[in-house]
């Protein structure tokens, strides 16, 4: 049952990247409208993003909330220019999305080399720790933050010259690496999140390898 | 539960090659990193290399190095072992393990192994 | 590339008995050191990672610790099914290299 020629949603599907989160759905709004609720498993329903001709619908404001709980949202359609009308069962057509845990599965986003730098046969090799849209105090958290020790990198190294990559990992943003003196090497991280089960690899970084700017050399 | 079930092996003369394949179940490779071990007869284990699934990147034991492939296939689930320019000494049952991603656990899960016997 | 030097290459040993196996990196490698155990005709079990801890569903009589570049493997109390060939392994870098392996054979 449902409101006379309105649709209910359907793929409802969670979009997000270090928390930054958006529900989209389908179909493109033909002479309707949508409404979306959010709740934890516990909690009260709220509403966001009324009356809208889109098909998706920024949650990150509430999921920031508390990462580690498991969201629901529904989307309701309501015909346009009529959002006070109801079905035959006084109830607006909705569809549930599927359950969303943010800490266990938000995607985890392209990560950044913001510096490296040879001392002789040792390179320091440092991720950018980037900053999250979740708050604490007032101020914003970075994945470290968030993560703490379950998250690790993974450094991919390889000479100019060669194919093959070596790895290295870390559960801190720095890596501290042996290489060949006078060798050029190249650079890749991707960040992991090995107790999970499903989106444990974040894509790899863009590569940077010595011998450009972001590299500083000290040989001694 | 994970599985990893490698297949292909047999006899092959020197100088032959041969693909061996290791089926994965109850995980996705991509999530993880997959690596070949090799045992030659009454001998210990070695290193033979490494695949990320997700990026493609490869590392080699020098053994091997420029005479064998590692690759995969997301989409099959499976990672490949392509072994060309084989010698005697490549003679070994060839394992294929998974590697678990974190700085702590290391190969938590292996394949039964599949025997490979290079002679003429 | 790192060495991982083990001894001794074979023992003999009673069940009850508490059995040592040691592995020396050749270089630093952090507390980045695996043990297997492997029985004939079967692929490698993971026992011990990170130096000193137990996988999961492995027995409490086998433990591991390190001392600077030393490993050692410890079974407290020797079973039946512990005779076996073990070996350590080194992921500090990459390549990962394996010891020659202990097998632990019934006296």
């Known amino acids: 049952s449902g409101t006379t020629n309105t649709v209910a949603a359907y793929n409802l599907t969670w979009k997000s990247t270090n928390f930054k989160t958006i529900l989209e759905w389908e179909p493109k709004p033909v002479n309707q409208v949508y409404t979306v609720q959010i709740s934890t498993k516990s909690g009260d329903w709220k509403s966001k993003c009324f009356y809208t001709t889109d098909t998706e619908c920024d949650l990150t404001d509430e999921i920031v909330k508390d990462v580690k709980q498991t969201y629901l949202a529904r989307v309701f359609s309501y015909p346009a220019g009529n959002v006070e009308s109801t079905g035959s069962a006084g109830e607006p057509l909705y569809e549930n999305s599927p359950e969303f845990t943010p800490y266990l599965e938000t995607n985890l986003g392209q990560p950044t080399i913001q510096s490296f730098e040879q001392v002789g046969t040792k390179v320091n090799v440092t991720v950018e720790d980037e900053r999250t849209l979740v708050r604490r105090n007032n101020t914003f958290l970075s994945l470290r933050d968030v993560f703490g020790k379950d998250l690790i990198y993974t450094l991919y190294y390889w000479k100019s010259s060669s194919s093959g990559k070596k790895t290295a990992k870390t559960n801190t943003n720095e890596f501290l690496i042996d290489v060949d003196k006078g060798e050029n090497y190249c650079f890749s991280v991707q960040a992991v999140i090995p107790s999970r089960t499903v989106n444990r690899k974040s894509t790899d970084s863009p590569v940077e390898c010595m011998g450009q700017e972001k590299g500083e050399f000290r040989e001694i | 539960e994970v599985q990893l079930v490698e297949s292909g092996g047999g006899l092959v003369q020197p100088g032959g090659s041969l693909r061996l394949s290791c089926a994965a179940s109850?995980?996705?490779?991509?999530?993880?990193?997959i690596h070949w071990v090799r045992q030659a007869p009454g001998k210990g284990l070695e290193w033979v290399g490494y695949?990320?699934?997700?990026?493609?990147?490869?590392y080699y034991a020098d053994s091997v190095k420029g005479r064998f492939t590692i690759s995969a296939d997301t989409s099959k689930n499976t990672a490949y072992l392509q072994m060309n320019s084989l010698r005697a000494e490549d003679t070994a049952v060839y394992y294929c393990?998974?590697?678990?991603?974190?700085?702590?656990?290391?190969?938590?899960?292996w394949g039964q192994g599949t025997l490979v016997t290079v002679s003429s | 590339d790192i060495q991982m030097t083990q001894s001794p290459s074979s023992l003999s040993a009673s069940v009850g008995d508490r059995v040592t196996i040691t592995c020396r990196a050749s270089?630093?490698?952090?507390?980045?050191v695996a043990w297997y155990q492997q029985k004939p005709g079967k692929a490698p079990k993971l026992l011990i990672y990170?130096?000193?801890f137990l996988y999961s569903g492995v027995p409490s009589r086998f433990s591991g610790s390190r001392s600077g570049t030393d490993f050692t493997l410890t079974i407290s109390s020797l079973q039946p099914e512990d005779f076996a060939t073990y070996y350590c392994?080194?992921?500090?870098?990459?390549?990962?290299?394996f010891g020659q392996g202990t097998k632990v054979e019934i006296k």
């Open positions: 393990a998974r590697d678990y991603g974190s700085i702590q656990v290391f190969l938590d899960y």
């Open positions: 109850g995980f996705t490779i991509s999530g993880y990193w």
């Open positions: 695949i990320d699934p997700a990026n493609g990147f490869t």
């Open positions: 270089q630093d490698v952090n507390t980045a």
């Open positions: 990170s130096a000193s």
């Open positions: 392994q080194q992921h500090y870098t990459t390549p990962p290299t």
